[in-house]
């Protein structure tokens, strides 16, 4: 015997107090999907976090982060502070690169420079705390 | 026991007003997400309008926003909707529901009133 319930599109939730018809998902919920006994709370972005999508009744809402900040973490579910190109982020803030590492992005960790000599090379360019040293022949 | 109880509702011109009450009983209408639902003849249910995260915000469907305005007297436990520049498509039983949040996390409505019917004609 098919479930009445699975007759319910998304959009809506099959209403067990009333003879499992199909009733529209509340404001501020959402189902993404058909057959759904209840309807979902939408994200709210708040805080640092700003709408990039709005919630509609068949989609939850999408967030990014305000300017200086970046997501991180499945569908951003965390927002980190930016810091400028030759820094780094550590626990008392953003601090320039040690001598001999560099980072490019506004995120993640400095890296060493390649060790051009590894590969037979010389220096071409010197690293800088924003850029790694271009290797040469 | 959760109750609502709906009225107001009749026969009106286009371009009419009317306003909806709800008197809530079993629970405090201030401190719940509350809001009016809507059937029309042969259709499904459509949320028109609610006030949400204990009065923080307000929700009006598309087709009522600057028309249909939500409130509601705390002191008389009572929720209302008032309806102005009425047009046919605006013909339903209006019916007052409570947002019923669940312990794992989802969403649904109850509606414990007969609902009360808005007809729009001349």
């Known amino acids: 015997l098919q479930d009445p319930c699975s007759n319910c599109p998304a959009g809506t939730f099959c209403d067990n107090n009333r003879n499992q018809i199909c009733s529209p998902c509340p404001p501020n919920s959402f189902s993404s999907a058909g057959g759904q006994r209840t309807c979902d709370i939408c994200r709210q972005c708040k805080g640092v976090f700003r709408t990039r999508k709005e919630c509609s009744s068949t989609s939850n809402a999408e967030c990014d982060c305000t300017p200086g900040f970046h997501c991180l973490g499945a569908g951003c579910s965390m927002c980190e502070q930016d810091c400028k190109q030759g820094q780094e982020l550590t626990k008392k803030g953003c601090k320039d690169c040690c001598f001999g590492t560099f980072n490019d992005q506004k995120r993640g960790i400095c890296r060493p420079w390649t060790n051009c000599s590894l590969d037979g090379k010389s220096v071409l360019v010197n690293g800088t705390k924003e850029r790694d040293v271009v290797c040469g022949p | 026991e959760v109750q609502l109880l709906e009225s107001g509702g009749g026969l009106v011109q286009p371009g009419g007003s009317l306003r909806l009450s709800c008197a809530a009983s079993?629970?405090?209408?201030?401190?719940?997400?509350v809001g009016w639902v809507r059937q029309a003849p042969g259709k499904g249910l459509e949320w028109v309008s609610a006030?949400?995260?204990?009065?923080?915000?307000?929700y009006y469907a598309e087709s009522v926003k600057g028309r249909f305005t939500i409130s509601r007297d705390n002191a008389k436990n009572t929720l209302y909707l008032q309806m102005s520049s009425l047009r046919a498509e605006d013909t339903a039983v209006y019916y007052c529901?409570?947002?019923?949040?669940?312990?794992?996390?989802?969403?649904?409505?109850?509606?414990r009133g007969q609902g009360t019917q808005v007809t729009v004609s001349s």
């Open positions: 006030i949400l995260d204990s009065g923080g915000s307000t």
């Open positions: 079993g629970f405090t209408v201030s401190a719940e997400d």
């Open positions: 529901a409570r947002v019923v949040y669940h312990s794992g996390g989802g969403v649904t409505f109850d509606l």
